[in-house]
């Protein structure tokens, strides 16, 4: 969380942003809140990106003002207009690109004063892994697949029974470039698995960490997976 204060002639207002990550090809949110004003027409929101030749987005007098928007953001940005009055200046970014990564500034002017706060926005690709029993293999084998990752992640296997065991010798991980030539499909195979055990396939890069669990017993297979974004700090 980053909290910024204005320092100019009028009073300062508190602006709060949260560092976040965008999944390339999907829509993302750059979060920003501020002390609300009673009149929408008195609120100006400017989103800036470090080193960019124009504005990312501007909202003033109750509507978008995009005459100074930089070409790389044209047609891809929107604020939540109905929520501005309650202090939400968050920006929706459509079709996140790798090049959208960087430092952004949420700059607010209201009748109470001015304020701004920066946020770090990371971009990459991350997806939920799915772990299955590979019945085609000659021995008991698990196959962990995740369709989209970037940058290239690390893959680590763990087991509930053999806690702390190193499975690198009995696993094989491959990365296959997807058709858009940026993201990659992750496939990891774990050999010599035993029943009545829970295995976890953990995929991690500097943006996200995802885990796929599988519990194999004589009578059933249970799966669970979750994904966590890393470094979500508020300003």
């Amino acid at each position: 969380l980053i909290i910024g204060f204005g320092i100019s002639g009028r009073h300062s207002i508190t602006v709060t942003t949260v560092a976040s990550a965008g999944n390339i090809g999907e829509d993302g949110i750059l979060s920003c809140t501020f002390e609300p004003d009673i009149k929408l027409s008195d609120i100006v929101i400017q989103w800036l990106k470090e080193g960019v030749l124009g504005l990312v987005h501007e909202f003033k007098e109750g509507k978008d003002e995009l005459s100074e928007q930089d070409e790389m953001f044209r047609g891809r940005t929107a604020v939540f207009a109905d929520q501005v009055i309650v202090g939400n200046a968050s920006l929706r970014l459509k079709n996140v690109q790798l090049t959208d990564a960087g430092t952004y500034k949420c700059y607010i002017i209201t009748s109470k004063g001015k304020g701004n706060a920066n946020l770090e926005y990371k971009t990459g690709a991350f997806s939920m892994p799915e772990v299955n029993v590979d019945y085609n293999a000659s021995s008991e084998t698990l196959r962990c697949e995740a369709p989209r990752w970037f940058p290239q992640p690390t893959v680590v296997w763990a087991s509930q029974v053999d806690q702390g065991a190193n499975f690198s010798e009995v696993s094989n991980t491959s990365f296959e470039l997807n058709s858009e030539n940026v993201t990659m499909k992750v496939v990891s195979v774990l050999y010599n698995v035993t029943i009545n055990n829970t295995y976890s396939c953990m995929i991690e890069n500097d943006i996200a960490k995802a885990t796929g669990d599988i519990k194999v017993t004589e009578s059933e297979i249970k799966r669970r997976s979750h994904l966590q974004l890393l470094n979500s700090k508020a300003s």
């Epitope: 030749l53 504005l55 100074e68």
Partner: antibody
Framework: EVQLLESGGGLVQPGGSLRLSCAAS????????MSWVRQAPGKGLEWVSA????????QYADSVKGRFTISRDNSKNTLYLQMNSLRAEDTAVYYC???????????????WGQGTLVTVSS | DIQLTQSPSTLSASVGDRVTITCRAS??????LAWFQQKPGKAPKLLIY???SLEGGVPSRFSGSGSGTEFTLTISSLQPDDFATYYC?????????FGQGTKVEIK
């Protein structure tokens, strides 16, 4: 200390090509847009081209559009200007300048190189 | 592209004079205007950005004002070091443009 050092100028024939470089130091290069500005002998300043910090956006003056290409290599802290189909009227001292960090909120053209002379003549 | 017109082209003044240079834009540029000083054989020096913000290290006798299409640079009391050529410059999301320059010379 911020420093910008241009190189690559010289004498070239009309229709020829030249590539200017600008080596930057003393600041986080990728955080700033960069520009090229030129000044013909005894004339005023003319902005030529600009490029965003990440290299994703570029701008050109109408007089050079389609002939000049601006680029940057952030790993080398270097700005470039590829000049093709050169004309006599392109003769000038070419400056690289540090452009904005934050559009509308920060200084721009606050640091300049010493300039490199490009002469287009047969 | 946006055109900038400076006036006058040349200005003769004496030390201690109050000097005003005008810059007009062909369309509204809000406050996206900077002022530069250039001396012969030297690179330009930034004086004012965002129409009225004084660059660090620049003497307070320099000031800028205006918004939209009309801008002014004022030197409240001209000093010997101030004889030079002054340029306005607009910046927006698709271009930058300089004015043609105003030469301030000794009367």
């Amino acid at each position: 200390e911020v420093q910008l050092l241009e190189s690559g100028g010289g004498l070239v024939q009309p229709g020829g090509s030249l590539r200017l470089s600008c080596a930057a130091s003393g600041f986080t290069f990728s955080s700033y847009a960069m520009s090229w500005v030129r000044q013909a002998p005894g004339k005023g300043l003319e902005w030529v081209s600009a490029i965003s910090g990440g290299g994703g956006s570029t701008q050109y003056a109408d007089s050079v559009k389609g002939r000049f290409t601006i680029s940057r290599d952030n790993s080398k802290n270097t700005l470039y200007l590829q000049m093709n189909s050169l004309r006599a009227e392109d003769t000038a001292v070419y400056y690289c300048a540090r452009d904005i960090q934050w559009f509308g909120e920060s200084t721009l053209f606050d640091y300049w190189g010493q300039g490199t002379l490009v002469t287009v003549s047969s | 592209d946006i055109q900038l017109t400076q006036s006058p082209s040349t200005l003769s003044a004496s030390v201690g004079d109050r000097v005003t240079i005008t810059c007009r834009a062909s369309q509204s540029i809000r406050s996206w205007l900077a002022w530069f000083q250039q001396k012969p054989g030297k690179a330009p020096k930034l004086l004012i950005y965002k129409a009225s913000s004084l660059e660090g290290g620049v003497p307070s006798r320099f000031s800028g004002s205006g918004s939209g299409t009309e801008f002014t640079l004022t030197i409240s009391s001209l000093q010997p070091d101030d004889f030079a050529t002054y340029y306005c410059q607009q910046y927006n999301s698709y271009s930058r443009t300089f004015g043609q320059g105003t030469k301030v010379e000794i009367k």
